[in-house]
């Protein structure tokens, strides 16, 4: 399955929107930095396309879920959020189309299941952090920065998959 060129353009737009969402000076948030333990090894180049598509899908789905909460709506600009949802939704559709076309339809490898679980646990840690920080503006900025970094890393994986073909 070939992810359309518009998919990588959408990824770049998503990162741009995340950058635009910033609401306060980040310099005041340094003490709120946190190690969320992004499972970088799950996004290594050793994966084949059949294994990566569901992991990437899980990553984007979790980002969608995180920013679709009531607390998120209160934290960010509504217009930017709506554009952000649209971009994520399109990317989910692209990835789902790939799965339907037969990529990853065969017996799910255990490694892939472990990777999806690792991504879910990563987002659980982010959600817990926000809760502990009482969804403060700085906590949201730390999370936004983290999502920009992890999304960028997963986007790089998509690009490396495309270039391998």
């Amino acid at each position: 399955c070939d992810l359309p060129q518009t998919h990588s353009l959408g990824s770049r737009r998503t990162l741009m929107l995340l950058a635009q969402m910033r609401r306060i000076s980040l310099f005041s948030c340094l003490k709120d930095r946190h190690d969320f333990g992004f499972p970088q090894e799950e996004f290594g180049n050793q994966f084949q396309k059949a294994e990566t598509i569901p992991v990437l899908h899980e990553m984007i789905q979790q980002i969608f879920n995180l920013f679709s909460t009531k607390d998120s709506s209160a934290a960010w600009d509504e217009t930017l959020l709506d554009k952000f949802y649209t971009e994520l939704y399109q990317q989910l559709n692209d990835l789902e189309a790939c799965v339907i076309q037969g990529v990853g339809v065969t017996e799910t490898p255990l490694m892939k299941e472990d990777s999806i679980l690792a991504v879910r646990k990563y987002f659980q840690r982010i959600t817990l952090y926000l809760k502990e920080k009482k969804y403060s503006p700085c906590a949201w900025e730390v999370v936004r920065a983290e999502i920009m970094r992890s999304f960028s890393l997963s986007t790089n994986l998509q690009e490396s998959l495309r270039s391998k073909e």
């Epitope: 980040l26 310099f27 948030c29 340094l30 003490k31 930095r33 190690d35 920065a145 983290e146 920009m148």
Partner: antibody, heavy 121, light 107 residues
């Protein structure tokens, strides 16, 4: 390969203006902040200020506030440190270094080679 | 501003010695403490970040510990290339501040 390349040594007279640069390469320039550090001859390191190149938000150490201006041009991945009127006491080595912002990653992991500024009449 | 105080300001040691440098912050900085090594005419080099994380490429003889206000840099077995000046720096809040430095000299 990540690199921060600073402009060359400068010899200036008191009262003159100066702008030195720090060009980043091998990484996403807007994903990291750029900090500036002064080291006077035979002395320790002094933190001057920092810039977020993504939107040019800046913060200064009180000792340097109003004395210098930090800026950046993200289109050419370059940060700047400038003086409008130099003093003899500005004679020092100036370093730039990158900072990961709010991400959990090493602080100031890459440094420029330094720019020696000499102010003498 | 948060003041960073290093001790000692200088020390003499021999190759193979265990060397310990301490850094104290004027208020709690959690684990946001970095250690740098600087040799004459060179830019500082990051050794330890977040108090105890070893920077990539740095020999394992360097280690850091501490949290809150008191921190330590340890060189387990001093090597000839380790003779340099060491600085601690807090990155908990702006303005970031450095310690005054510790010069490690040959005995």
């Amino acid at each position: 390969e990540v690199q921060l390349v600073q402009s060359g040594a400068e010899v200036k007279k008191p009262g003159e203006s100066l702008k030195i640069s720090c060009k980043g390469s091998g990484y996403s320039f807007t994903s990291y902040w750029i900090g500036w550090v002064r080291q006077m001859p035979g002395k320790g390191l002094e933190w001057m200020g920092i810039i977020d190149p993504s939107d040019s938000d800046t913060a200064y150490s009180p000792s340097f506030q109003g004395q210098v201006t930090i800026s950046a041009d993200k289109s050419i991945s370059t940060a700047y440190l400038q003086w409008s009127s130099l003093k003899a006491s500005d004679t020092a080595m100036y370093y730039c270094a990158r900072h990961p912002g709010l991400n959990w990653a090493p602080d100031f992991d890459y440094w420029g080679q330094g720019t020696l500024v000499t102010v003498s009449s | 501003d948060i003041q960073m105080t290093q001790s000692p300001s200088s020390l003499s040691a021999s190759v193979g010695d265990r060397v310990t440098i301490t850094c104290r912050a004027s208020q709690s900085i959690s684990k946001f403490l970095n250690w740098y090594q600087q040799k004459p005419g060179k830019a500082p080099k990051l050794l330890i970040y977040f108090a105890s994380s070893l920077q990539s490429g740095v020999p394992s003889r360097f280690s850091g510990s501490g949290s809150g206000t008191d921190f330590t840099l340890t060189i387990s077995s001093l090597q000839p290339e380790d003779f340099a000046t060491y600085y601690c720096q807090q990155s908990n809040t702006l303005p970031f501040t450095f310690g005054q430095g510790t010069k490690v000299e040959i005995k």
